[in-house]
């Protein structure tokens, strides 16, 4: 079996963590978040070739069926395996508050 | 906000559970699974338009950034939200065994 972390398409082409710099406006948060004003958004981007970072048995099945029926079954998709928490300073009716989110920033990625 | 389960692309076009009929050969299992010989594989297929079955805040961010930078950030992707277990009768060195897998068949879907 191919190494699950070796990308056969070339360096950086397969499913991995990317960082995208975004403002509150970019994120659609400007009306309810005060801070941070800019976020280094970590997300999972890239192709999922056979056996690359397969999350589970379902991903293996999906890849096998995709090869058989590419018009019906899509290839596995690069999504977060876990997340990093993040705290935001938000606007409230009475002023400001802190709120923590545990599903904002991808921590690592796999193919499902 | 749009209803998270109403598909704006038309019935059946958005992220949902599909069933694909597959043989052991299709799945690449013929050399290690004895039964079942055919599986009704449930998997998540379909588009993820804005606000449709968004799994979490990360999915919202991804969609907003996809609209801004479609060449850099892909749209959210339709993946299993949970799985149904399945029992396989497997070949072993000494004969056969029953093994339960809890990550084979998608139970429901969302966009991440």
């Amino acid at each position: 079996a191919r190494n699950g972390d070796r990308c056969p398409l070339g360096p950086g082409r397969c499913c991995r963590l990317h960082t995208v710099h975004a403002s509150l406006e970019d994120l659609g948060w400007a009306d309810w978040v005060l801070s941070p004003r800019e976020v280094q958004v970590t997300m999972c981007i890239g192709a999922c070739p056979s056996q690359f970072r397969e999350a589970n048995m379902h991903a293996q099945i999906k890849m096998n069926l995709h090869r058989l029926k590419p018009d019906t079954v899509p290839a596995p998709c690069c999504v977060p395996a876990s997340y990093n928490p993040m705290v935001l300073i938000q606007k409230t009716d009475t002023g400001v508050s802190l709120q923590t989110y545990d599903d904002l920033l991808a921590k690592d990625c796999h193919c499902v | 906000a749009r209803n998270g389960d109403r598909c704006p692309l038309g019935p059946g076009r958005c992220c949902r559970l599909h069933t694909v009929h597959a043989s052991l050969e299709d799945l690449g299992w013929a050399d290690w699974v004895l039964s079942p010989r055919e599986v009704q594989v449930t998997m998540c297929i379909g588009a993820c338009p804005s606000q449709f079955r968004e799994a979490n805040m990360h999915a919202q961010i991804k969609m907003n950034l996809h609209r801004l930078k479609p060449d850099t950030v892909p749209a959210p992707c339709c993946v299993p939200a949970s799985y149904n277990p399945m029992v396989l009768i497997q070949k072993t060195d000494t004969g056969v065994s029953l093994q339960t897998y809890d990550d084979l068949l998608a139970k429901d879907c969302h966009c991440v």
């Epitope: 801070s35 280094q40 990093n84 928490p85 705290v87 300073i89 400001v96 | -």
Partner: antibody, heavy 119, light 110 residues
Framework: EVQLVQSGAEVKKPGESLKISCKGS????????IGWVRQMPGKGLEWMGV????????IYSPSFQGQVTISADKSISTAYLQWSSLKASDTAMYYC????????????WGQGTLVTVSS | QSVLTQPPSVSGAPGQRVTISCSGS????????VNWYQQLPGTAPKLLIY???NRPSGVPDRFSGSKSGTSASLAITGLQAEDEADYYC??????????FGGGTKLTVLG
Amino acid sequence: EVQLVQSGAEVKKPGESLKISCKGSGYSFTSYWIGWVRQMPGKGLEWMGVIDPGGSYTIYSPSFQGQVTISADKSISTAYLQWSSLKASDTAMYYCARYGRYGTYFDYWGQGTLVTVSS
Amino acid sequence: QSVLTQPPSVSGAPGQRVTISCSGSSSNIGVLYVNWYQQLPGTAPKLLIYSNDNRPSGVPDRFSGSKSGTSASLAITGLQAEDEADYYCQSWDSSSNYVFGGGTKLTVLG
């Protein structure tokens, strides 16, 4: 190199006012929140509040709301903690700390300022 | 009374493995992260572990963190004399925001 340098130790009488400082260097001061943490003699750490030096938004722990004021002057990369009327129970070591990128932890700490309030 | 509960003290001989527990509830550790800080005698706290199990650069791999349910733990292997310090866990609680454990004094025997 990221550094937070706090002002020196203070000895005050009950009822007096006080403002202690925390100067950041080696990073973009307005890009990271600053928190203040109290440690009373022989005791543990208590979070007091946070400021975003860029927007000057402040949020206080319920235990410290109305007891202290947190502020910042971004032109000189300095955060402040002040009291308008000190009490003997304010005697403690006070630390400023920079929040990490996600705002969930403190990645750099000042050396601490010891405040002693005694008549 | 801290929202997060730690044992007041633990001890171990040089070379041994020790663990420090941090018990919370479903409103803090149960759903969120845990960070750990080391405070050597007479110094400011220092970040040791963040987001349950991540080590900042410069922290030896003898230190590791883990989380299960509403509890977290810090493990120190190959205990050294310079590890003698106070250790604090920290998380988040919806009512009081950033919360610390009461601290654990680690004594290295011998």
